[in-house]
Every structure is written in C-alpha cells, then in structure tokens.
C-alpha cells in the first residue's frame, strides 16, 4: 500500500485496530481520552478504553456489524459523552455533547487545558514503584500514559508510546539492580526532562497549525527538512512536508490512531527511500518502529552538497524573476526557501522564514513596479540586518550566561521579562523565564555554526508556552500582540519590548515575602523556584528597581535562608529574621 493511499475501509475502527495492533490501539485510545477529559479518574478511562477495544474487536471479526461503519470521532465522542459526571467536572464542556460531528470534536479540542488544575506528580520511593511495577506491569504503564497525557493534552501520541517503552525498559532493568535508586532515578529524570521538551516542541507545532494555518506549518517544515536533508530534491522534500503535515494535523486534531498509523507509514517510506533523502538515516532505519520514528525526527543534518550554485543568479539577477513568481507563486517561494535553507544549516528556521517573507513581500511590491528588476535588485541586502539581529542577541546573551551561570542568568531574564510584561502571573513568568534561561546551557556550548538554530528555535518553543498559557487567561495586550501578529517574529517582538510604563505597581503584601522552615527540606531546584518567585514579586512591586538594588535584596534573601536553615529553631528564625529582611528590603527599594 502506498503512503496515505489506502483502500476504502468499511470500518475505520477495525482498520486502525488491525494496522496498529491491540497494544498500541489501547494505548492510543487511552491517550486520546485522557487528553480530552483531563480530570477523569484513571479507572474511568480504563473502563472506557476496554469498552472501545471490545467493540473494535467485534468490527475486526465482522466489518458490517452494527455501528462499525461510524467514524472514529463519532465512536469516541459518543463514548466520552457517556461519562456521568461530565457537567459537574467539566462545566460548559458538557455542552459539546449536544453537538454533531465534526463540531463536537472541535468543541472538545477547544476545551483542552494547557494548564490543568492537577496535583504535581510526586515520585514515590523506588521500592514502592518497583513493587507496583512487578505487581501489575500493564496497569503501571497505563497509569504513566494517563498521567502524562492528561497533563500534556497536545503530547505527540506516537512519541508518548516511545517514552512509555523507555519507561518500561528502565523499570525492567533497574528493579533487578543491586542499587535500584542509582540505576532508576537518573533514567526517570532524563525521561521527565526529555518529555517536557517533547511536549513543548509539539505544542508549538499544534499552535502553528491551529493559529496560523497549514501554510505556516508547511513553510516551517520545508525550511527544517531542507536543512536536515540538503541532498534531497525539492520534490522529495515537498512530499515529506505534505506527509508530515498530515501526521501533525491528525495528532493536533485528536486523531491519534490515524496519526500513529501515518507516522509509521512515513518512517517506512523514508527508510525505503533513504538513498534519495539522506546519508544519515542508516542507523535509524535499522531500529524497531517507535525508536526508528524518534530517531528520524532527531537525525542530524546531512552534509551539504558541494558546489551549490549562487542563489543570486536566478532569484535576484535574472530578468525572469517576476515571470517565475507569477507563474507559480508557492512553488517559486517554496524553492527559494528550500534553496536558502539547504545552504544555511547555521540559521534558525524562524530566521529562514523571515528571509522568505521579506523576499515574498519585495516581489509583491516590485513585480507591480515600473522597473521590477531595479526594484528587487537589492533584496539580498535587506537580509543582512535580519541575520545580524539574532546573531548579536545570541552573542550577548551567551556572554552573559557564561559570566553568570544558569541560575543567575535565569534571574536576569526573570527581571527582564517581568518588567516587559508585569501583568503575567508569577508562576508563568517563573516557568517561562527559567526555561528561557536554559537556552544558555543548551546552546552556548555549541560552535557558532550551531548556536543560532539551537537557540532561536528553542526560544520559539518556550515563548509558545508563554503564548498558550496567556491565551487561557489573557492579561496583557503586549503579550497578545506578540503572540498573534506573526509566528516567526514572536521572539523579536518580545525582545523589542521595553519596560511597561503603563503598569501600576502591585500593592506590597508582606505575606508574599513570608517564608517558613519547609523551604529547608526542598530540593535545590524547588528552593530556586521559591527565590525566583520572590524576585518576580519584588519586580512587580518595584518595576523601576535597578539591577544593583535587586541583587542586594536577593543576596540578603539567600543569606537569610541559609542562616535560618542552619538555626536550631528554624521556624522562629524565619519569623523574626524574615520581618527584619522585609523591612530592610522595603527600605532598600524605597517601598
């Protein structure tokens, strides 16, 4: 069967069950249900999944059986709408059930919550986890899928299957080890960090598709795949882009069975045609399906072909530019983006898209001018400042990161972003600024040629987190403007924001700066978050505070925590010394 050209199936649910196999089918249905109904208990979801699975089996046995011809959205939506507590638990989401497909599914999608009110996942003791794993491995792994999916409603479902496979492997290996904790905990930390990164990357893909449309996503994919597969022909890249767009559209739309099935087909196609795509795929293509798909998605850029001709000849110097553009605008612009991207693995994808947009805008203007050639002759000169802006920004920030280290670099960004958008909630500012600060450790170690794609494309992912969290409860027109005007200019838009002069400082509340002995038992990371939360609150109270003033207060605060955590009577120390610290800080900041 060719990629995505399937025979018509009498029963879609039977078709997907047969393609994916029972294990993957059940896992994907569980993920889908948990991503839609994020508050439902685990047991309720398992029950729904088992019912759907039993029904699918009857359709496999007889595709003409009753209801087997229904669409997956109809079947799954009907099942979700049987949940008894829908109105009490989800409020207006229950109104979705009064709608018909496809409106009902769209309604469910609109109610996905990027920041659900769920308790933080607390990791039990290793022995407790190993016992649970051995007692009922299937339930243990399902619980993992459920907990991740409900907290990350846009997590890339086929990739979550890969994470679950690694999660299982970690427990299988480490629960037999002499030192279970030493074996298991680093693996779980790695999975957690990779999982958060994977979730955020996928969230940007879904935002790109849903907020800016298919054309925006395809442009992103052309640029990225052209960098990754510079030896591939434009038609090959175009085919991969079309197929990849279908896969991500399905996953972002909640069509997880189709998405996983099509992703497997795409991996198969890539591996069957790797000679025409990239020399770097050999190892990936020898792996089992889930590992193979993950490996392809992360594969390093192939080497650029030697002797690529100059782009100026055909895209600037030629008298036929406007003829070419008029004949087939999207193909011509697509080729421009492909040709530019394959020559520039050193550029971020968003920079390449800015250049392509500048080129398009110039042609739109110049091809209507009296002398088009004269008008567009200098278009490549317009690229220079666009390239230099991220280069300079990365250079400055990497120097700052190397000077301060990650924690203090995060603090500098916390101050910077709180002054830009002080209306944003403190937890969001802390989370986003901490992630922005991680760009230093992630990217500044790279040589110049790899810094920009690493840094700016990572920042796009993090700023998208800010955008989706802010969209849920909008509080700042400036955030809304930067998030909605242009996908590729989000980072420059935020970078360009100065201190918000219209902001009325927050009333001082001593309770915000009252700390207790429980801070002493927190992990280093949690303690940092407490201190960073206080820093954001300080800036919200005193947005005009200088770096020096804030540094002095934060140094005093760090000394206060250290002193009281060493005290015999910690709680008394925190109460008494805390009052003094608040008074001193108020004086230092003129509050």
């Amino acid at each position: 069967r060719g990629v995505f050209r399937r025979d018509a199936h009498k029963s879609e649910v039977a078709h997907r069950f047969k393609d994916l196999g029972e294990e993957n089918f059940k896992a994907l249905v569980l993920i889908a249900f948990a991503q839609y109904l994020q508050q439902c208990p685990f047991e309720d979801h398992v029950k729904l999944v088992n019912e759907v699975t039993e029904f699918a089996k009857t359709c496999v046995a007889d595709e003409s059986a009753e209801n087997c011809d229904k669409s997956l959205h109809t079947l799954f939506g009907d099942k979700l709408c049987t949940v008894a507590t829908l109105r009490e638990t989800y409020g207006e989401m229950a109104d979705c059930c009064a709608k018909q497909e496809p409106e009902r599914n769209e309604c469910f999608l609109q109610h996905k919550d990027d920041n659900p009110n769920l308790p933080r996942l607390v990791r039990p003791e290793v022995d407790v986890m190993c016992t649970a794993f051995h007692d009922n491995e299937e339930t243990f792994l399902k619980k993992y899928l459920y907990e991740i999916a409900r907290r990350h409603p846009y997590f890339y479902a086929p990739e979550l299957l890969f994470f679950a496979k690694r999660y299982k492997a970690a427990f299988t290996e480490c629960c037999q080890a002499a030192d279970k904790a030493a074996c298991l905990l680093p693996k779980l930390d790695e999975l957690r960090d990779e999982g958060k990164a994977s979730s955020a990357k996928q969230r940007l893909k879904c935002a790109s598709l849903q907020k800016f449309g298919e054309r925006a996503f395809k442009a992103w994919a052309v640029a990225r795949l052209s960098q990754r597969f510079p030896k591939a022909e434009f038609a090959e890249v175009s085919k991969l882009v079309t197929d990849l767009t279908k896969v991500h559209t399905e996953c972002c739309h909640g069509d997880l069975l189709e998405c996983a099935d099509d992703r497997a087909d795409l991996a198969k196609y890539i591996c069957e045609n790797q000679d025409s795509i990239s020399s770097k795929l050999k190892e990936c293509c020898e792996k089992p399906l889930l590992e193979k798909s993950h490996c392809i998605a992360e594969v390093e850029n192939d080497e650029m072909p030697a002797d690529l001709p100059s782009l100026a000849a055909d895209f600037v110097e030629s008298k036929d530019v406007c003829k070419n553009y008029a004949e087939a605008k999207d193909v011509f612009l697509g080729m421009f983006l492909y040709e530019y991207a394959r020559r520039h693995p050193d550029y971020s994808v968003v920079l390449l898209l800015r250049l392509a947009k500048t080129y398009e805008t110039t042609l739109e203007k110049c091809c209507a001018a009296a002398d088009p050639h004269e008008c567009y002759a200098k278009v490549f000169d317009e690229f220079k400042p666009l390239v230099e802006e991220p280069q300079n920004l990365i250079k400055q920030n990497c120097e700052l990161f190397e000077q301060l280290g990650e924690y203090k670099f995060q603090n500098a960004l916390l101050v910077r972003y709180t002054k830009k958008v002080p209306q944003v909630s403190t937890p969001t500012l802390v989370e986003v600024s901490r992630n922005l600060g991680k760009v230093g450790s992630k990217c500044c170690k790279h040589p110049e040629a790899k810094r920009m794609p690493c840094a700016e494309d990572y920042l796009s992912v993090v700023l998208n987190q800010l955008c989706v969290l802010h969209e849920k409860t909008p509080v700042s027109d400036r955030v809304t403007k930067c998030c909605t005007e242009s996908l590729v200019n989000r980072r420059p838009c935020f970078s360009a924001l100065e201190v918000d002069e219209t902001y009325v400082p927050k009333e001082f509340n001593a309770e915000t700066f009252t700390f207790h002995a429980d801070i002493c038992t927190l992990s280093e990371k949690e303690r940092q978050i407490k201190k960073q939360t206080a820093l954001v609150e300080l800036v919200k109270h005193k947005p005009k505070a200088t770096k020096e003033q804030l540094k002095a207060v934060m140094d005093d605060f760090a000394a206060f925590v250290e002193k009281c955590c060493k005290a015999d009577d910690k709680e008394t120390c925190f109460a008494e010394e805390g009052k003094k610290l608040v008074a001193a800080s108020q004086a230092a900041l003129g509050l």
Epitope: E233, P309, M335
Partner: nanobody, 125 residues
Framework: EVQLLESGGGLVQPGGSLRLSCAAS????????MGWFRQAPGKEREGVSS????????FYTNSVKGRFTISRDNSKNTLYLQMNSLRAEDTAVYYC??????????????????WGQGTLVTVSS
Amino acid sequence: EVQLLESGGGLVQPGGSLRLSCAASGFTFLTSCMGWFRQAPGKEREGVSSIYTVGGSTFYTNSVKGRFTISRDNSKNTLYLQMNSLRAEDTAVYYCAAGSPARCRLRDPTTFDYWGQGTLVTVSS
C-alpha cells in the same frame, strides 16, 4: 504544444566524451525541472541527472557522479549533458524530460510530464 528535441548522441570509444543537447519549445524555462534519463536494451528507464531552471541545483545518479555534468541555458531554452570518461555500461537511449520541481524526482520517471524522442549513445571500441 511542448516539444523536447535531443541531439548529440553517437558512437564513442570507452574513456571518450560526448555532449548531449535538448532544445525545448512550446514552453519557457520558467520554474521547471529538466532531466536526462536513459534506457539500455532490456532494462528499465533510469534517471541520470536533473537540474532546476531556478536555483540551478543539480542531482546525479551515483553511477555518473564526477563524470557527467548537467547544465542549462535559460535564454536559449536548452539543456545539456556533458558526458566524460564514458564506459560501455553507459550505452543507452538518452531522453530529455521536463516537469514541475514540486513533483519531479530523478528516481521516478513518472514524475516528469514531458519527454523527448531520445538520442542513442553507444560506447564501444
């Protein structure tokens, strides 16, 4: 009506050179993809080399890399294939083809829309 007319084929000794030309009429070399294919007796048609008329990027099948060079002259609507260090296994009918760059792939002749009649290249001593 689109027409592609190949020329330059002939008999040449192993190690020798030939230059094939393909004159296109009925369409202009705008945003298109031009390619050379060959078919030896009893074998399937295979892609040799292709070039984009915009951007000028070139692609070659592994067996001819370093020996053959594709080029184009957009002002003359003409495609060329310079063949050096010819071998007996290069013997075939060589076809010129054209298509859209969004579709044409060297490994798949069906992705090219227009074809010439072919010119025979024989490499023999």
